[in-house]
Interface confidence: low
């Protein structure tokens, strides 16, 4: 593989600090085209993750083989994926970077996910910033996936991609719908073109066994070294702080390798140095733990120690990759100098030793300060050591001192004294205090002064609404921030207590004292704007308005929709009690009348401003009904109306409709209209004979009015099935005369 | 007035195809979220499939998923769901149903509820 | 997946009287995204409460939801004949999955 290495300092405090650095190894690497090779390329690819367009980069070239871009101005500019190119000819070769915003909703787990074809990748994004919406996965920039937010898996989104092939390397980003891409999860997923422990064309042959989390190379089976290891197996470790395929490139800096991350040819991908972790690997590994991304553990056997840069250090006597050789006397093994436990905790401790005779359960026992000798439960026996368990009695403090493991054997003995401490689990003597205070939310400093011993490891805050008999609701804060209580009441009184840990089992202490935060009510400052409305009826209105989008919870409670009628000087209020309420139907209101409208936010008793108002008409009603509506038959299939005139009207009547409908039947009814409007009578023809029908009847100027009393007539005789009624008006002295 | 009037149902047998349309009217269509329920026989009612208001994305149950598909036009107000590979157990009144879908400005949109709905259409 | 479990299955009262259906869920329901609807013999379901208390547009005040994280209840305060039909709560999120319970029958004694 080429020796090209990508380093990306990572220290984010200030973005114009930050660099990138592409180093080649490679004989006469990044002279150009007068020596023996193409140069370095390194940029910003924004065919995928595109930036808002800021000031160009800054590349400079330091000797042969390096070239540093800088010059970013925004933390912005930093999101997304950079690449160096480096090598000549078919060796040429293109190492990607992909950064992630430390302030990004969504946060990779881990960015560089390599696998073997066939096997099933699975991608996860940390929640950073909730946003209670979906979770767009895509795939080198094109729409892939959505995730419900309810799907979150303990605060994690995740995307499977089962039996992977080769094209479906690239890069993945998870993104909350309708958020900024550079909140986005940024992911690269390297597939090998062979399953677990092959390569070359066929995937036939079979990889070196690549040690240390080297990768083997699907092309050339050459194994791919993780920064700080070298050798055809990378089985062995550089000096703290150099790297490149020789060791032959050292970090910049004092620090050494801390906040650099290390890009390498596929299929590597990148990863913090040897000894460091970390999103921005400035975390030195934790004991036990070595190498890059400090993946790999030492296990070391025997008293020797782990260097977080090179894995086991043997003491004299023993070798191997876990010190795990050794002489024959017994031994006690991996004994730490120094344990802690909290109080009226039962814990385990476990001894393992070693030697020849091999030893047994009975050969191991636990001393503690006052003489107590303790025999082991169980005893777990490997080829190379017995582990033996020792569940310990209930813990008081005078248990704290020096213990001692023994193990005996015909081959000897050997003995080692390790410190016990017995730590008192914390209990805060203050209440926690409020820093600032909003309408939905508290800031509380959770920090106080405490009984027993630190550190405090976890800071709970357990919060209720004051006087309630609800469940406490908790949130875990880190100790060293202020923590921010959201999604309160507003103007409400809220019990807040302070519950403290420690490390280790048993650890968390009683809950501190209670005090009242109560939560603010701040004034709406968002204007509403009317989008529409539309009349139902003669006094009936619905309204729709909208609100802009601004970042950040909405502040208000509710909508109050005014009214104005100008004419007879009133005002109706509507208060629409749902902050999420976007539309409203008025009723109640006074056909024919002009009204101004307008809505405004309101947020407990505080108005915000009213929107910009809007004039709304309502259609006049229809006039009252007629009166003294009569039915008179008048044959076998005629029957005689005549009424008086509505009284009061607001204008000239258009028409009256007649209702006519057959007494006790099941049919719709017939209107009739009756276009003469100063008529008083009207007869209704080819009724059925012997046949009791009902009738009523209403007047319409602009809209129809209210309908007449209901009249009863049947009609006479029995002569034949009539077609259907008909009408003819006259007059009503004329009707009479005939 | 809001409506939504789904047609399509019938009789089909198991493995033949059946696409549902569901006209709407009274509202923006184009702004809303759309989505279909359905209700065996005697049963209770089952979500089946959901779609965003420009039509980019789509949701499925476990149940049909990979033999539905939802769409939508919105050029038309009508939205639609086709049904490939049907068994017996997709027998139902399927609904369409409008999504009450509103943001609450700065934490994404929610979709708290089917404010209107068809009156069902029988497969 | 979060599933809605309604208790009881059945409930018999007489108009009147105070009715109380219960709604769990497997999980916690996220910022009380739970919805409850009415179902009457024949006719499509009826939203009548969103965010587990607010009350939809036209709905009776005899209707009231409460309850948050898992458990759920819908109250009829008084029940008037028209209130006799099938119950379903329902979860929702910001996407378009949604979780139905199995439903609570209301019937008259």
């Known amino acids: 593989a080429v020796d090209l290495t990508l380093l990306a300092n990572l220290r984010l405090t200030d973005p114009q600090r930050f660099f990138l650095t592409c180093v080649s190894g490679e004989a006469g690497a990044g002279r150009g085209s007068d020596a023996w090779g193409p140069p370095l390329l390194l940029e910003k690819d924004d065919r995928i993750v595109r930036t808002p367009p800021g000031p160009p980069l800054r590349l400079a070239r330091n000797g042969s083989h390096q070239v540093t871009l800088r010059g970013f101005s925004k933390p912005s500019d930093l999101v997304g994926v950079f690449s160096c190119v480096g090598g000549a000819g078919a060796r040429r070769t293109r190492v990607i970077y992909v950064h992630n915003s430390p302030g990004a909703h969504l946060l990779p787990d881990k960015v560089t996910h390599t696998v073997n074809k066939g096997d099933t990748a699975v991608l996860s994004a940390r929640v950073h910033k909730e946003k209670q919406t979906d979770v767009i996965w895509k795939s080198n920039g094109s729409y892939f996936y959505t995730l419900d937010w309810h799907e979150a898996q303990d605060g994690r989104f995740l995307l499977q991609l089962p039996n992977v092939q080769p094209p479906s390397s690239g890069i993945y980003s998870a993104t909350y719908l309708e958020a900024s891409p550079l909140g986005s999860a940024f992911f690269r997923l390297i597939v090998r073109g062979c399953g677990a422990g092959r390569w070359g064309p066929g995937c036939t042959k079979e990889c070196p066994g690549c040690l240390h989390g080297g990768v083997c190379h699907d092309h050339d089976g050459e194994c791919v070294c993780p920064p700080g290891f070298t050798g055809t197996r990378c089985e062995q470790a550089c000096r703290e702080g150099r790297f490149g395929q020789s060791c032959q490139e050292q970090c910049p800096g004092i620090s050494g390798c801390r906040g650099l991350t290390f890009c390498l040819p596929d299929p590597y991908g990148c990863s913090c140095g040897s000894g460091w972790r970390g999103s921005q690997c400035q975390e030195a590994c934790a004991p036990g733990h070595f190498g890059a991304d400090c993946r790999l553990q030492c296990q070391c056997q025997n008293g020797g120690t782990c260097d977080r840069f090179s894995g086991c250090v043997c003491p004299s006597g023993w070798h191997g990759v876990h010190c795990e050789k050794s002489d024959r006397i017994p031994q006690i093994l991996n004994m730490a100098s120094e344990l802690e436990f909290n109080l009226e905790t039962m814990p385990r401790i476990n001894c393992a030793a070693a030697g020849n005779p091999f030893p047994v359960r009975g050969s191991i026992e636990l001393r503690k300060p006052d003489g107590t000798v303790l025999l082991s439960t169980k005893a777990i026996v490997e080829p190379e050591k017995t582990t033996a368990e020792f569940e310990v009695p209930r813990l008081v403090l005078a248990d704290s001192g020096f213990w001692e493991c023994r193990v005996s054997t015909s081959g000897g003995q050997d003995s080692r004294r390790f410190k016990v401490n017995v730590k008192v689990p914390p209990v805060p003597l203050a209440a926690p205090r409020l820093l600032t205070k909003q309408s939905r939310q508290l800031v509380v400093s959770p920090l106080v002064s405490f009984s027993g011993d630190g550190p405090i490891s976890t800071v709970r805050l357990h919060y209720r609404p004051q006087d309630s008999t609800m469940d406490w609701s908790t949130i875990v804060v880190d100790p060293s921030e202020n923590v921010t209580l959201m999604n309160l009441r507003p103007k409400t009184g809220y019990s807040v207590r302070v519950q403290l840990s420690r490390p280790g089992e048993g650890g968390e202490g009683a809950w501190g004292p209670p005090t009242l935060m109560t939560t603010d009510c701040p004034e709406p400052l968002l204007q509403p704007w009317l989008e529409g409305w539309h009349v139902e009826g003669t006094d009936r209105l619905r309204v729709s308005w909208s609100l802009p989008l601004v970042p950040g919870p909405l502040v208000g409670d509710g909508f109050l929709l005014r009214l104005w009628d100008g004419t007879r000087g009133q005002e109706r209020r509507e208060n629409v009690s749902s902050p999420q309420a976007r539309t409203a139907l008025l009723t109640g209101l006074t056909p024919g009348t002009h009204y101004q409208l307008d809505v405004q936010l309101y947020h407990c008793t505080l108005l915000g401003p009213a929107s910009p108002p809007a004039h709304v008409l309502l259609p006049p009603s229809g006039p009252p009904a007629p009166r003294h509506l009569h039915a008179q038959a008048l044959s076998d299939s005629e029957i005689q109306l005549t009424w008086k005139h509505p009284e009061a009207l607001p204008g000239p009547i258009s028409k009256y409709v007649v209702e006519v409908q057959v007494a006790g039947g099941a049919g719709d009814p017939l209107w009739i209209d009756v276009d003469r409007p100063e008529e008083t009578s009207t007869i209704i023809r080819g009724l059925n004979a012997s046949t009791r029908y009902l009738f009523r009847m209403r007047a319409s100027i602009q809209g129809l009015g209210d309908w007449s009393n209901t009249v009863e007539e049947s009609t006479l005789g029995n002569g034949l099935q009539a077609e259907g009624p008909v009408q003819e008006s006259r007059a009503a002295e004329e009707g009479l005369d005939q | 007035e809001v409506q939504l009037l789904e047609s399509g149902g019938g009789l089909v047998q198991p493995g033949g195809s059946l696409r549902l349309s569901c006209a709407a009217s009274?509202?923006?269509?184009?702004?809303?979220?759309m989505v279909w329920v359905r209700q065996a026989p005697g049963k209770g009612l089952e979500w089946v499939s959901g779609i965003y208001p420009s039509g980019g994305h789509t949701k499925y149950a476990d149940s049909v998923k990979g033999r539905f598909t939802i769409s939508r036009d919105n050029s038309k107000n009508t939205l639609y769901l086709q049904m490939n590979s049907l068994r017996a157990e997709d027998t139902a009144v399927y609904y369409c149903?409008?999504?009450?879908?509103?943001?609450?400005?700065?934490?994404?949109?929610?979709?708290?509820?089917?404010?209107?709905w068809g009156q069902g259409t029988l497969v | 997946d979060i599933q809605m479990t309604q208790s009881p299955g059945t409930l018999s009262l007489s108009p009147g009287e105070r009715a109380t259906l219960f709604c769990r869920a497997s999980q916690r329901v996220t910022s009380n995204s739970l919805a409850w609807y009415q179902q009457r013999p024949g006719q499509a379901p009826r939203l009548l409460i969103y965010?587990?208390?607010t009350r939809a547009t036209g709905i009776p005040d005899r209707f009231s939801g409460s309850g948050s994280g898992r458990d759920f209840t819908l109250t009829i305060s008084r029940l008037e004949p028209e209130d006799f039909a099938v119950y379903y709560c329902q979860r929702y999120g910001s996407s378009v999955l949604y979780s139905f319970g199995q439903g609570t029958k209301l019937e008259i004694t």
């Open positions: 009274g509202f923006t269509f184009s702004n809303y979220v």
């Open positions: 965010d587990a208390s």
């Open positions: 149903a409008r999504v009450n879908y509103y943001d609450s400005s700065g934490y994404g949109p929610i979709a708290p509820g089917l404010d209107y």
